[in-house]
């Protein structure tokens, strides 16, 4: 884990962030709340909203086409992630090829949750663990052998595993709602500022 | 403040798919989050359906369990109105539905909370007979 000192206002060490963050005019629109202090480059910020773009090489449409109201959430989620300067807390070191850091446990908002899952229920998934299990021969993801296709409430049947496994654990459900000021908005307006902001600096203080 | 007016509402017969509408002024309407209520008489007032008009990715809506399915809300920018359409009702349908208006920006269930709203029809009421 990080030094204490290091919780707010930082950037992890992984494949596509800035060492700091700084402002970032041109983040390209659902990346667009995180321009005045950001983790990503404009062009990770387009990049984040292509199908198998060069960020992961990740493909949505695994199991038939994503519905545009599912996928936008997943966008938000490669936003926040590539994007946000108030995840200190939550980062954790890992021994990976493409990465020396990752985000473990962030108390994600339930409502952004439950918004996600209902956004994705006539979606098509063949996994609950989107890290790791894929057949990546092709240069991109597919399912692997003997991994049925089901609608994403036969892998995630409440919000709360859709939030805490899809990603292995780097998100968790918080029991917290939006503006409580304890838990992260995947989602926010950002003429009413970053929310996000006050939740990190609350976690901080609970960890020093 | 914003100012909402509900209208579609009336008599209908199990089945039946009348369409709610809640027209706004006085609020730059691109940006609101805003929810569709009922309450018969006796119970609480619980949220139906919601929808956040704003936003790089536009609107986001959300449903009660008991509606889903049935009911969908849906916005018209350019007649700065939102609508409830109402499919498959039943007698447990019955109610006065109200529109409510907040600018915070709310998705899930937070939609569906009438605390989180600062602003309210009159309401329009639906009977739905067998």
């Known amino acids: 884990a990080r030094p204490r000192t290091e919780l707010l206002n930082v950037c992890m060490d992984a494949k596509h962030h800035k060492e700091k963050p700084s402002p970032e005019d041109g983040l390209h629109k659902q990346c667009s709340p995180w321009k005045k202090n950001s983790c990503c480059f404009a062009n990770t910020s387009r990049e984040a909203h292509k199908d198998i773009s060069y960020l992961y090489r990740f493909n949505w449409n695994h199991c038939g086409s994503m519905t545009p109201a599912c996928k936008k959430h997943f966008i938000q989620d490669t936003c926040l992630y590539e994007c946000s300067p108030n995840l200190g807390p939550w980062i954790q070191e890992v021994n990976q090829s493409w990465r020396k850091e990752r985000i473990l446990h962030v108390p994600l908002c339930k409502e952004d949750c439950e918004q996600w899952w209902q956004d994705c229920r006539t979606s098509y998934t063949c996994k609950s663990n989107w890290h790791k299990g894929w057949n990546w021969t092709s240069g991109y993801n597919q399912c692997p052998e003997g991994a049925a296709c089901h609608p994403f409430h036969f892998y995630f049947p409440t919000s709360a595993a859709l939030c805490s496994e899809i990603w292995s654990h780097s998100y968790k459900v918080s029991n917290y709602s939006r503006g409580s000021g304890r838990c992260i908005q995947m989602w926010f307006d950002p003429a009413q500022g970053n929310p996000n902001e006050e939740v990190a600096r609350f976690y901080a203080r609970a960890m020093s | 403040q914003v100012q909402l007016v509900e209208s579609g509402g009336g008599s209908v017969q199990t089945g039946g798919s009348p369409r709610l509408s809640c027209a706004v002024s006085g609020h730059t309407y691109s940006r609101l989050s805003m929810g569709w209520f009922r309450q018969a008489p006796g119970k609480e007032r619980e949220g139906v359906a919601g929808?956040?008009?704003?936003?790089?990715?536009?609107?986001?809506?959300y449903y009660a369990d008991s509606v889903k399915g049935r009911f969908t809300i849906s916005q018209d920018n350019a007649q700065r109105t939102v609508y409830l359409q109402m499919n498959s009702l039943k007698p447990e349908d019955t109610a006065m539905y109200y529109c409510?208006?907040?600018?915070?920006?709310?998705?899930?269930?937070?939609?569906?909370?009438?605390?989180?709203?600062?602003?309210w029809g009159q309401g329009t009421q639906v009977t739905v007979s067998s």
């Open positions: 929808i956040y008009t704003g936003g790089p990715s536009g609107p986001m809506t």
């Open positions: 409510a208006a907040t600018p915070q920006f709310l998705i899930g269930s937070g939609l569906l909370r009438p605390d989180k709203y600062n602003s």
